[in-house]
Interface confidence: low
């Protein structure tokens, strides 16, 4: 019997926190050898499958979902699953996305203090939380 | 029009002090963070220093080039920045940006003010 | 601190040609990567922001690619205006570093 595979992550490029009519990635990580990534709505009513996996480091693969330019249709929580191997995955932790006009005039541009961040968004600032590693993708509100 | 006018530049000793003041304009100054950027005679871009906003405690940050010497600080009141730069060193010499970002890229700069330590 | 390594630092090209130029970090930085030019005496001016995002105005011709630690720039159909200074920033952490600069030349 096969163990349990890996739940996937998720995170949103450059951030979680959009403007209308920008441009944003949510991207899904798992294993290597992953077949096809999902992402879904927190309902199921949609979702999108890509077969379009690149290795994004020796023990992790990751599917890439760009949005071009946002609406409020796209705001909302977002989780991730993959196939490997015939079996589906379990899912991810949900990502919320957030869809607010800011005219660029806001102090955090990632997100707002109470969100959580993924992965590839900005860590604290290293001169103020000198034990935070640069991979641990603290909420931006540390740094700006 | 975001319109960012940086005043205060000069000729100054080694050891020296300055204060650069930013009138900003056209834009709701207080709930943006603000940066100083530095270039040298003929060289790259240094970031200098940084602001966040009332929100966020004026929370300061800066190049380790400067630490210790350059201070940050605004007036939110005036939309004015500043940045006070003592004990300065020859290699402070360059042209100093007041920049304002934009989802945090520094997207409005300033037409900058000369800086020059010398003997 | 996260260095940006530029590449070329010098690069020379016609009128019409496209180039690209680009732009290592030392650690991931996802897309926090913003691409300006800066024409001789003036202040710099951002034409890519989040990796991949035209900023406000700036012409088409202008395309930015990349995430992570490799990122690149590309001029398409280069124009006269284009040859100037052109500079990568990561804005992932403070400091908030630059790379070291491109020059364009007309050949």
């Known amino acids: 019997q096969e163990g349990p595979l890996p739940r996937p992550s998720i995170s949103a490029e450059p951030g979680t926190v959009i403007p209308p009519g920008r441009p944003v990635t949510i991207v899904c990580r798992g294993p290597v050898g992953v077949d096809q990534f999902r992402l879904e709505r927190e309902d199921r009513s949609k979702f999108n499958d890509t077969k379009d996996v690149s290795q994004a480091s020796p023990s992790e693969s990751e599917a890439r979902f760009r949005i071009d330019s946002v609406s409020e249709g796209n705001a909302g929580h977002y989780r991730c699953l993959y196939v490997k191997s015939t079996r589906w995955s379990e899912h991810s932790d949900y990502l919320d996305l957030v869809v607010k006009e800011t005219s660029g005039d806001t102090d955090s541009p990632v997100t707002e203090p109470d969100s959580s961040a993924g992965p590839t968004q900005r860590p604290s600032d290293n001169s103020h939380n000198e034990h935070a590693p640069a991979s641990q993708g603290l909420s931006a509100e540390h740094l700006y | 029009e975001v319109q960012l006018v940086e005043t205060g530049g000069g000729l100054v000793q080694p050891k020296g002090s300055l204060k650069l003041s930013c009138a900003a304009s056209?834009?709701?100054?207080?709930?943006?963070?603000m940066n100083w950027v530095r270039q040298a005679p003929g060289k790259g871009l240094e970031w200098v220093a940084r602001i966040r906003t009332k929100n966020n405690n004026y929370a300061t940050f800066y190049a380790d080039s400067v630490k210790d010497r350059f201070t940050i600080s605004r007036d939110d009141s005036q939309s004015m920045l500043y940045l006070q730069m003592n004990n300065l060193k020859t290699d402070d010499t360059a042209m100093y940006y007041c920049?304002?970002?934009?989802?945090?890229?520094?997207?409005?700069w300033g037409q900058g003010t000369p800086v020059t330590v010398s003997a | 601190d996260i260095q940006m390594t530029q590449s070329p630092a010098s690069q020379s090209a016609s009128l019409g040609e496209s180039v690209t130029i680009t732009c290592l970090a030392s650690q991931t930085i996802g897309t926090w990567l913003g691409w300006y030019r800066q024409k001789p005496g003036k202040s710099p001016q951002l034409l890519i922001y989040?990796?991949?995002s035209l900023a406000d105005g700036v012409p088409s011709r202008f395309s930015g690619s990349g995430s992570g630690t490799k990122f690149s720039f590309k001029i398409s159909s280069l124009q006269a205006e284009d040859f100037v200074i052109y500079y990568c920033?990561?804005?992932?952490?403070?400091?908030?570093?630059f790379g070291s600069g491109t020059k364009l030349e007309i050949k």
């Open positions: 056209g834009f709701t100054f207080n709930i943006n963070a």
């Open positions: 989040a990796a991949t």
């Open positions: 920033q990561q804005l992932y952490s403070t400091p908030l570093t």
């Open positions: 920049v304002r970002d934009r989802a945090g890229f520094f997207a409005y």
